[in-house]
Interface confidence: low
């Protein structure tokens, strides 16, 4: 009689995570008598998956009734597959022996590959805000996917970015993989409403990629421009000077008026107006009693925006001249060492 062969007809099986894997195995003969065992991996380090003779294997069910006398179908189903179940599975026939059964013949093996979806990409930006023209880095991470092949793209407001580096880990074979990408984005003054998007495409997603987003409003700081102007006379000996604070973001801003270097009033931006680009404008005014000053008055509008070094703009008010003749002095004073002059 022809010697028993163990047939594993499927060289590979592909299963989505959470589904049930069917691993097929048949024997060509009933002889010799003895049980079938399933292993993951081969050699001394292999892992027992199912033993027909004994043991408890809650995730494994047999396709056929192995207690039937003439059964030669030793296929099994493994439920709730996870990426950790990936590997080569061997159907092994044992010959009844004393005291122990002896391995007799093995099937050629079935490679179980598990497809697992990547987690939703998480995009994170820099810890500190940055100003326009600066380059900032955003990271995108997604985990738990299999197989390893994956595509990651970056977008800013729908426009694909090219300056990024991506790593898929681990470098070798693994039950599942993680992707980590860092993109560099140059900020512009119009980026308050901008979004950075990380898009991950994987075979498990059936052409519907996952996206993670970050709002540049969390990252950008647009410093204000200041303009100090003198308004027409409101009353005899009184001059109204306004400080226009334009195009700033975020809203956190404190303004201080100084008369000849002495603090006159400090206020916090409250009723701001929002521009289309998401930046804010604000105006503060100071009523100066000219008759109270013997000499010329230097009025300074000093602004501290979002905890940054103060920037200021001054206006010279000549007491001797008629208030209506005063124009705006455009000379800027910069009290912040890290800020450029704002005109």
């Amino acid at each position: 009689e022809e010697e028993l062969q163990v047939i594993q007809p499927d060289k590979s099986v592909l299963v989505a995570a959470g589904e049930t894997a069917t691993l097929r195995c048949t024997a060509t003969s009933l002889i010799p008598v003895g049980p079938i065992q399933w292993f993951r991996g081969a050699g001394p380090g292999r892992e027992l998956i199912y033993n027909q003779k004994e043991g408890h294997f809650p995730r494994v069910t047999t396709v056929s009734d192995l207690t039937k006398r003439n059964n030669m179908d030793f296929s099994i189903r493994i439920g709730n597959i996870t990426p950790a179940d990936a590997g080569t599975y061997y159907c092994v026939k044992f010959r009844k022996g004393s005291p122990d059964d002896v391995e007799f013949k093995s099937g050629a093996g079935t490679e179980l590959s598990v497809r697992a979806k990547p987690s939703a990409p998480v995009v994170s930006g820099p810890a500190a805000r940055a100003t326009p023209q600066h380059t900032v880095s955003f990271t995108c991470e997604s985990h738990g996917f299999s197989p390893r092949d994956i595509t990651l793209k970056w977008f800013k407001n729908g426009n694909e970015l090219s300056d990024f580096q991506t790593n898929v880990d681990p470098v070798g074979e693994s039950v599942s993989y993680s992707i980590h990408s860092t993109a560099k984005v140059v900020l512009t003054r119009e980026d308050v409403h901008s979004q950075v998007i990380c898009e991950v495409a994987h075979v498990t997603l059936q052409g519907d990629p996952l996206r993670g987003t970050a709002n540049l409003s969390e990252t950008i700081r647009v410093p204000p421009t200041l303009e100090v102007t003198q308004q027409p006379v409101r009353a005899e000996n009184q001059v109204n000077v306004t400080c226009q604070v334009r195009k700033f973001y975020p809203q956190r801003l404190q303004l201080t008026w100084l008369e000849n270097g002495n603090v006159s009033r400090t206020e916090t931006a409250s009723t701001v107006t929002e521009n289309k680009d998401g930046t804010y404008n604000w105006m503060s005014w100071l009523l100066v009693n000219v008759s109270a000053h013997r000499d010329d008055v230097k009025l300074t509008c000093q602004v501290e925006h979002d905890g940054q070094p103060a920037v200021s703009k001054s206006h010279d008010l000549k007491v001797s001249a008629h208030p209506k003749e005063q124009g705006s002095n455009t000379a800027a004073e910069n009290t912040g060492s890290n800020e450029r002059n704002i005109y």
Epitope: G41, A42, G43, P44, G45, R46, E141, H143, D169, P170, V171, G172, E173, S174, S178, H180
Partner: antibody, heavy 122, light 112 residues
Framework: QVQLQESGPGLVRPSETLSLTCTVS????????WSWIRQPPGKGLEWIGF???????FYNPSLKSRVTISLDTSKNQFSLKMTSVTAADTAVYYC????????????????WGQGTTVTVSS | DIVMTQSPLSLPVTPGEPASISCKSS???????????LDWYLQRPGQSPQLLIY???NRASGVPDRFSGSGSGTDFTLKISRVEAEDVGVFYC?????????FGGGTKVEIK
Amino acid sequence: QVQLQESGPGLVRPSETLSLTCTVSGGSIRNYYWSWIRQPPGKGLEWIGFIYYNGRTFYNPSLKSRVTISLDTSKNQFSLKMTSVTAADTAVYYCARVRAYSGIGLDGTDVWGQGTTVTVSS
Amino acid sequence: DIVMTQSPLSLPVTPGEPASISCKSSQSLLYSNGYAYLDWYLQRPGQSPQLLIYQGSNRASGVPDRFSGSGSGTDFTLKISRVEAEDVGVFYCMQALQTPLTFGGGTKVEIK
């Protein structure tokens, strides 16, 4: 218990090729990285490279142009070939098993061979 | 490449006393999964290196509990709570985060 045993010539002529084999006994090749590390006399350890059980290789960039690591799973062996050797390649060469089961990184080089001394001299 | 810097270079110890070795990496070995991929090895005189600690703080199988690893990011420490005579040798740290794997220069522990 897994054991590693290096084998190969102890003396290699300059400009020739160094060839070493590591035999793995008492365990499986599968699911590990198989590494080569060297130690010049009186100096520290230098990683040469490793091969994963699926055949993927990774090398130290400083040696990459001269090094090849290969794997023969049927014999439970992996090998190192280093071309164009010089006296600077004189060292004790270790083969080792590197675990990898936590994701991105490696989880310890837990089994080492006893090392084989290779002298490059004419 | 990640550069690993160990200190001190040499450490004279008294049996029964504690000892501590520092290892610094040129970039963080802490990955987003929470693991710090740093190993500690001991190479006794005339022997192969032996794994003591992996992932910064996990003791390898069979390693006595007098050895402990700590640290995260770029600064790591190996502590021996009570030095024994068999602990003499050269201790190496190694980063296992990315290739090429790189070792520290070693710390030679010797009995006073």
